[in-house]
Interface confidence: low
């Protein structure tokens, strides 16, 4: 790994052992300045593997609202607008980090948590068995 | 929003103002117990809008490694295995939270940061402008 010299101006860390508790500033810095927010807003409808977005809310989590994609069909939409079952709509999943209040209901104490979310769907060729 | 009674066993918070600094336990809890890791492993190759995965590494960020999807084609793969430019491969993007070391190089002090990542690609019908 890359070793970086420690900044002498860092806050003191009480506990040097894992599980490590760190200080986190929740004033979010958004680096997405150059992105067009509308860009992917309608892909869920225009895709050949369209999906619905479901709201998942949990006040004990930060962020408290996460949107989950669910593929509308098992097959994919063909050129005629019909569902073709020779192809499959599948969710594209990603592991993301969230903060979970710990102990519960505490406003200033969290634990890092990894969760799997479905972001959208893509159309794939079915798992085809190739016989030698 | 939902108001939850504060747990009396919470650690004390020095600063009640935003930007708020909180304590975060970095011992990650993984809630993805029921997922089958093989499921989406080959979608990037089997998709009609295939993508490549690029490694994005930043030692000042947690997690330090993030994988970015880049669509292989402008069009989508048709039944004959050729690229059809009547359809478009587009990236499905998601905003995720990461921790940015602040001040730089500090092992135990972070700021929450929102970044936009491309998770995979989907095939969409192009937006056609009808001229009156």
């Amino acid at each position: 790994g890359i070793t970086i010299p420690r900044n002498p101006g860092c806050p003191n860390s009480e506990d040097k052992n894992f599980p490590r508790t760190v200080m986190v500033n929740l004033n979010i810095h958004n680096r997405n300045t150059n992105t067009n927010p509308k860009r992917s807003s309608d892909y869920y409808n225009r895709s050949t593997s369209p999906w619905n977005l479901h709201r998942n809310e949990d006040p004990e989590r930060y962020p408290s609202v996460i949107w989950e994609a669910k593929c509308r069909h098992l097959g994919c939409i063909n050129a005629d607008g019909n569902v073709d079952y020779h192809m499959n709509s599948v969710p594209i999943q990603q592991e993301i980090l969230v903060l979970r209040r710990e102990p519960p209901h505490c406003p200033n104490s969290f634990r890092l948590e990894k969760i799997l979310v479905s972001v959208g769907c893509t159309c794939v060729t079915p798992i085809v068995h190739h016989v030698a | 929003g939902i108001t939850i009674p504060r747990n009396p066993g919470c650690p004390n918070s020095e600063d009640k103002n935003f930007p708020r600094t909180v304590m975060v336990n970095l011992n990650i809890h993984n809630r993805n117990t029921n997922t089958n890791p093989k499921r989406s492993s080959d979608y990037y190759n089997r998709s009609t809008s295939p993508w490549n995965l690029h490694r994005n590494e930043d030692p000042e960020r947690y997690p330090s490694v993030i994988w970015e999807a880049k669509c292989r084609h402008l069009g989508c793969i048709n039944a004959d295995g050729n690229v059809d430019y009547h359809m478009n491969s587009v990236p499905i993007q998601q905003e995720i939270l990461v921790l940015r070391r602040e001040p730089p190089h500090c092992p135990n002090s972070f700021r929450l940061e929102k970044i936009l990542v491309s998770v995979g690609c989907t095939c969409v019908t192009p937006i056609v402008h009808h001229v009156a």
């Epitope: 619905n52 479901h54 989950e68 669910k70 593929c71 509308r72 069909h73 098992l74 097959g75 569902v83 079952y85 020779h86 709509s89 599948v90 969710p91 769907c121 079915p126 798992i127 085809v128 068995h129 016989v131 | 089958n36 499921r39």
Partner: antibody
Framework: EVQLLESGGGLVQPGGSLRLSCAAS????????MIWVRQAPGKGLEWVSY????????VYADSVKGRFTISRDNSKNTLYLQMNSLRAEDTAVYYC????????????WGQGTTVTVSS | QSALTQPASVSGSPGQSITISCTGS?????????VSWYQQHPAKAPKLLIY???HRPSGVSNRFSGSKSGNTASLTISGLQGEDEADYYC??????????FGGGTKLTVL
């Protein structure tokens, strides 16, 4: 507890109609594809019909095409099967089952409701 | 939408292993890795045992395993137990419809 509960079965004359219901509980119904499967007395399983999670897509087995209609009401967590022009060969136990969007397996089944078509 | 072919019955003694075959064609079992297996006890609903040829849902005993060769899928039950006595059905995705089932196999534990 994840559960599917069918109802609406009974005795009907050939050419008659029946509407089956399947009440879902213990999971987010609108996230799942649903199907109906039937089993004639002493026979094997036969896939009947499929509906997408949002209700927008439906598919039918050749044996019921044009006679049966599958539908769902996600606000009521309920799946339906409207059966018209019933025939003696439609006599069976009808099961509803849940299909995740990852694969073509049916991971949760109801207990079944019996439909008898006889004069 | 003709059914996949399964043996009508198989039997085995407790502790033994048995295998149930499910033969299709190059349009279903041979083409796709979307083969599922279900167990059904008398007067009960079917239960998913295997999906995508080899994958077991959580809660299903590891005594149940699936495999495939060419146009034939197989379900193997090792360490046979009395409670395994039931009917077993295979199912596959096909090139003409989302699902087709096998005719079913009655397993008798001697």
């Amino acid at each position: 507890e994840v559960q599917l509960l069918e109802s609406g079965g009974g005795l009907v004359q050939p050419g008659g109609s029946l509407r089956l219901s399947c009440a879902a509980s213990g999971f987010t119904f609108s996230h799942y594809h649903m199907i109906w499967v039937r089993q004639a007395p002493g026979k094997g399983l036969e896939w009947v019909s499929y509906i997408g999670s949002s209700g927008g897509q439906t598919v039918y087995a050749d044996s019921v095409k044009g006679r049966f209609t599958i539908s769902r009401d996600n606000s009521k967590n309920t799946l339906y099967l409207q059966m018209n022009s019933l025939r003696a060969e439609d006599t069976a136990v009808y099961y509803c089952a849940r299909v995740p969007d990852y694969y073509y397996g049916m991971d949760v089944w109801g207990q079944g409701t019996t439909v008898t078509v006889s004069s | 939408q003709s059914a996949l072919t399964q043996p009508a019955s198989v039997s085995g003694s407790p502790g033994q292993s048995i295998t149930i075959s499910c033969t299709g064609s190059s349009d279903d079992v041979g083409r796709y890795d979307y083969v599922s297996w279900y167990q059904q006890h008398p007067a009960k609903a079917p239960k998913l045992l295997i999906y995508e040829v080899t994958h077991r849902p959580s809660g299903v005993s590891n005594r149940f395993s699936g495999s495939k060769s060419g146009n034939t899928a197989s379900l193997t039950i090792s360490g046979l137990q009395g409670e395994d006595e039931a009917d077993y059905y295979c199912s596959s995705h096909t090139s003409t419809s989302p699902w087709v089932f096998g005719g079913g196999t009655k397993l008798t534990v001697l």
